[in-house]
């Protein structure tokens, strides 16, 4: 039997400089594409190898992106969120929420779709 799973939630401001191939990550979520039950937020689903985000090292798969250059990502359609990133300019400031899984007791299994990545 698995122990109780808790999450340690932290927020961080990450400043990325757009590279030759862009910011270097994929997202899921939005009001029309809920990735996490009852949450229309925007989550990082992939960090591209050698991309700007990967080289910076702080953004992680499973992170929730709260804002881009100060603009809140709440209640956005998925494509509107994509477009916001694409039009964010050369220097991009991301407010992100990291959700670290803390296991109490025997180690559990995190399934696909869990926002912790």
């Amino acid at each position: 039997m698995n122990g109780r799973v808790d999450y340690l939630v932290t927020e961080e401001e990450i400043n990325l400089t757009r590279g030759p191939s862009g910011l270097g990550f994929n997202i899921v979520g939005g009001t029309d594409q809920q990735y996490v039950s009852n949450d229309s937020g925007i989550y990082v689903s992939r960090i591209k190898e050698n991309g700007a985000a990967a080289l910076d090292g702080r953004l992680q798969e499973g992170d929730k992106i709260l804002s881009v250059n100060g603009q809140d990502l709440k209640n956005l359609l998925h494509q509107d969120a994509v477009d916001l990133f694409r039009n964010a300019g050369y220097a991009v400031s991301l407010r992100v929420q990291h959700r670290l899984q803390v296991q109490n007791g025997p180690i559990g299994h995190r399934g696909e779709g869990d926002p912790s990545g």
Partner: nanobody, 127 residues
């Protein structure tokens, strides 16, 4: 881990039709960006078609435009490639590819590096 399984390949005469299917694992299928590629003997892997998470946006190689149609059924975790007016030069192993989510950068559907997961392929032979 996402797993992709293609089916529907076979031998068909020129001018005929085939419908390929690619069944995917994972409860977040509706977020996947999906593509079809093909590889003929002695040639490089070639982009065929791609579709976004909702099915609202599709992309095609010039060589198949007007003959092939990509579609998806998110309820069935499956992406399809309807191939009509087949030509001998369409003979190849056809591969399904997937990535979770949408890139925030400019999207090149024909770049294999855009995809993280690949099926084993299904053989299509047009005589």
């Amino acid at each position: 881990e996402v797993q992709l399984v293609e089916s529907g390949g076979g031998l068909v005469q020129a001018g005929g039709s085939l419908r390929l299917s690619c069944a995917a694992s994972g409860r977040t299928f509706s977020t996947y960006t999906l593509g079809w590629f093909r590889q003929a003997p002695g040639k490089e892997r070639e982009f065929v078609a791609a579709i976004n998470w909702s099915g609202g946006t599709t992309y095609y190689a010039d060589s198949v435009k007007g003959r092939f149609t990509i579609s998806r059924n998110n309820a069935k975790n499956t992406v399809y490639l309807q191939m009509n007016s087949l030509k001998p030069e369409d003979t190849a192993v056809y591969y399904c590819a997937a990535v979770i989510g949408s890139t925030v950068d400019s999207y090149d559907p024909g770049d294999p590096l855009e995809y993280d997961y690949w099926g084993q392929g299904t053989q299509v032979t047009v005589s």
